[in-house]
């Protein structure tokens, strides 16, 4: 946890004191924010935001949709965060299927994982079709998969996020990429 000189306002402390936490579906999430000037907890995932004014955030029976970033903020506007993954074998991905890209820019396929301990977190073409040869992507289990430098030829490309589980591919819902020309 951060340490600051006396007199200077410091960020809140969170228990458990780690940047990432993995819990099983159905288990309890219990996060404690210690700060005399506690203001609120904020939860964020995809486009969803929730707030809680209690300094202890308790979710009695965690669901996959409780996966996300939990941020505690104090009266000085300083904050500290913990990211919680809720492992649910029946729901490996959270998805926001809107997928727009501008030509020559990067775009994010929003399929964060509920469990980071997976193999080959990747993009796959729909119906077993290969991805374009020049398509490159950067995976981030907390955010999704970033497609690098979108080409005009990718317009209407059908994609799934994918992980390997016990020798088989598990696919997310499908995404259709809409590309806006650069000019």
């Amino acid at each position: 946890q951060p340490s600051v000189s006396p007199g200077e306002p410091s960020p809140p402390s969170i228990h458990p004191g780690k940047s990432d936490l993995i819990v099983r579906v159905g288990d309890e999430i219990r996060l404690l924010c210690t700060d005399p000037g506690f203001v609120k907890w904020t939860f964020e995932i995809l486009d969803e935001t929730n707030e809680n004014k209690q300094n202890e955030w308790i979710t009695e029976k965690a669901e996959a949709t409780n996966t996300g970033k939990y941020t505690c903020t104090n009266k000085h506007g300083l904050s500290n965060s913990i990211y919680v993954f809720v492992r649910d074998p029946a729901k490996l991905f959270l998805v926001d299927r809107s997928l727009y890209g501008k030509e020559d820019n990067d775009t994010l396929v929003r399929c964060p994982l509920t469990d980071p301990e997976v193999t080959n977190y990747s993009l796959k073409g729909c119906q077993g079709k290969p991805l374009p040869k020049d398509l490159r992507f950067i995976p981030d289990p907390k955010a999704g998969i970033m497609i690098k430098s979108v080409k005009r030829a990718y317009h209407r490309l059908c994609l799934h996020c994918s992980v390997d589980q016990e020798g088989k591919s598990v696919l997310s819902e499908k995404f259709i990429l809409k590309v806006r020309p650069a000019f």
Partner: nanobody
Amino acid sequence: QVQLVESGGGLVQAGGSLRLSCVASGRTFSSYAMGWFRQGPGKEREFAAAILSNGLTTYYADSVKGRFTISRDNAKDTVYLQMNSLKPEDTANYYCAAAFTPEFRDGGIWDDASVDYWGQGTQVTVSS
């Protein structure tokens, strides 16, 4: 600058096991995705396995799936490749790789153009 030093290569019989290690020095090891590529005699360099900076999310080429396991120990600035059920076709020079922002292509193959740092390699020979 990151320096990568591999060890653990050697001669092993088909069906045997080896564990490769790669120690990183320099920048913050825990911020980098790490992985292994290999180059067999007369072949192009190919991707074998990778592990993201979180230490949990892994990638394997089809040719090594189910036989090789990649892991990392951020406290020791080390990445490992446990190789089981080795085959003669696994004979190659094995190179450790590090990337701050690894880029992948179809099939979860780490594109070596996005590798920031390479090790010198360690030789693995599998005899039949």
